[in-house]
Interface confidence: medium
């Protein structure tokens, strides 16, 4: 007789997703230096023991604890970029900007980025076929807690200015929902981080308007001043030259504002 | 450096089976997949599958599919591919490789870097 | 399956002269190519990975380029031990397959 199984809102696990994620492992640790002490089986070990057996429902940052201790690593404080609804253009960023980090620059973040996973209670399965919803089942679900854990972890690590950059071609340009703004705006440490630098990508070629007005990131800035940081913003009318003008920035283009 | 060392070579009647080694010494062995590369005389580098021993799955190329059984010992570090019903066209020179990993914004890409010495498998009556 | 055409197949050249391999795939995958050399009676060696990322060791007279369907593997300058075969690898999809392969020969 089948089994009774569960099903979710959401995309099941992402194919190949214990191969990906040791592959991933293995790349990462190889590339990076001071990571090469880590050992991808105990990783994936620690990344299995986070969910499986477990209802998909019921997941705490405390399962991700083994996983976070493993993960633990080192990056420049000062040289953390957050992001919101805009990962590609700040993924492209940190790899010609070599020097600043996204979360997904991290070995833990680098593991997880895109994947999709969840398991059932009671047994060792991984469910191919569906998995939780954040809000059409559950918030406590295996791929939100991990993101929020992580998060949470990377905001609390930084310090100075710290950048984040947001999209300008929606509607709430600042979002209290999203993991940003419901995570990481709350988890700065205000004796360390002393500016969080906005910069909103502008969308349209033509839009010149000043999106740092905005209501939300007005809203953004009194959430930051009232936890003691400094709010700074900056338009980024071109993404395509902004981008451009870091690979080169001897260029003579690259005076004039981007 | 991760070396791997594979089995002599082999003599085989048609319709029997041929088991070949591959050890690896120098690396984390369990961590990384082990595929088998034949080539067989005037043809093309000819992917046969691959195992990863952390999890012991396998994944094998659809035409070698029910022939091929490649298997991994962690405790020596051997990796192991069986091939059954042999005929005269399995006649071939047989690579195992280790899997590294490229780029790839999901899936890293998979390249063979190194490779055993390679094991002359003949089928013949 | 995708299937890689290597062209020419067989390139004479002499030594210090440029030599340029073609591989070409079936449908777009991507810059998921790589490159490797076998000379007779050995193994073969990765080269290329990523279409243009040279393998740890690998002399820069060795590059790679290309995206989609067309790629190219050169050899600036072509040194005595650089005669022998050169094969491409596709890994954007399963199964993994290889090119017919180029034969570098002395002319």
């Known amino acids: 007789v089948p089994r009774w199984r569960q099903q979710w809102s959401g995309p099941g696990t992402t194919k190949r997703f214990p191969e990906t994620v040791l592959a991933r492992c293995v790349k990462y640790t190889e590339i990076h230096p001071e990571m090469r002490h880590v050992d991808c089986q105990s990783v994936w070990d620690a990344f299995k023991g986070a969910f499986i057996s477990k209802h998909p429902c019921n997941i705490t940052e405390e399962d991700y604890q083994p996983l976070m201790k493993l993960g633990t690593q080192t990056v420049p404080c000062n040289k953390i970029l957050l992001w919101s609804r805009i990962k590609d253009l700040a993924h492209q960023f940190t790899q010609v900007q070599r020097d600043m980090f996204t979360l997904e620059d991290t070995l833990l973040g680098y593991l997880a980025d895109d994947l999709t996973w969840c398991g059932e209670f009671n047994t060792s399965k991984i469910n191919y076929q569906s998995c939780p919803d954040w809000r059409k089942d559950c918030s406590n679900n295996p791929v939100s807690v991990f993101w929020k854990t992580v998060s949470r972890r990377f905001a609390e690590a930084a310090c100075d200015v710290v950048h984040v950059m947001l999209n300008g071609s929606r509607s709430k340009i600042f979002d209290k929902n999203s993991t940003f703004g419901s995570v990481e705006v709350h988890n700065l440490q205000p004796e360390k981080v002393q500016t969080l630098e906005a910069w909103v990508i502008h969308g349209g070629r033509e839009d010149s308007r000043d999106l740092c007005q905005d209501p939300t990131i007005k809203e953004l800035e009194s959430i930051i001043s009232k936890r003691n940081i400094q709010f700074s913003c900056k338009n980024i009318y071109r993404p395509d030259k902004f981008l451009q003008c870091v690979k080169n920035p001897e260029d003579s283009s690259c005076t004039s504002e981007i | 450096q991760v070396q791997l060392v594979q089995s002599g070579a082999e003599v085989k009647k048609p319709g029997s089976s041929v088991k070949v080694s591959c050890k690896a010494s120098?690396?984390?062995?369990?961590?990384?997949?082990i595929s088998w590369v034949r080539q067989a005389p005037g043809k093309r580098l000819e992917w046969m599958g691959w195992?990863?021993?952390?999890?012991?799955?396998?994944t094998y190329v659809q035409k070698f599919q029910g022939r091929v059984t490649i298997t991994a010992d962690e405790s020596t570090s051997t990796a192991y591919m069986e091939l059954s019903s042999l005929r005269s066209e399995d006649t071939a020179v047989y690579y195992c490789?280790?899997?590294?990993?490229?780029?790839?914004?999901?899936?890293?890409?998979?390249?063979?870097?190194?490779w055993g010495q390679g094991t002359l498998v003949t089928v013949s009556s | 399956e995708i299937v890689l055409t290597q062209s020419p197949a067989t390139l004479s050249a002499s030594p210090g002269e440029r030599a340029t391999l073609s591989c070409r795939a079936s449908?777009?995958?991507?810059?998921?190519l790589a490159w490797y050399q076998q000379k007779p009676g050995q193994a073969p060696r990765l080269l290329i990975q990523?279409?243009?990322t040279r393998a740890t060791g690998i002399p820069a007279r060795f590059s790679g380029s290309g995206s989609g369907t067309e790629f190219t593997l050169t050899i600036s300058s072509l040194q005595s031990e650089d005669f022998a075969v050169y094969y491409c690898?596709?890994?954007?999809?399963?199964?993994?397959?290889f090119g017919g392969g180029t034969k570098v020969d002395i002319k």
């Open positions: 690898q596709q890994s954007d999809n399963w199964p993994l397959t």
């Open positions: 195992i990863i021993p952390i999890f012991g799955t396998t």
């Open positions: 490789a280790r899997v590294k990993y490229g780029s790839g914004s999901y899936y890293p890409n998979n390249w063979f870097d190194p």
């Open positions: 990523d279409s243009s």
């Open positions: 449908q777009s995958i991507s810059s998921n």
């Open positions: 120098g690396g984390n062995f369990i961590s990384y997949s």
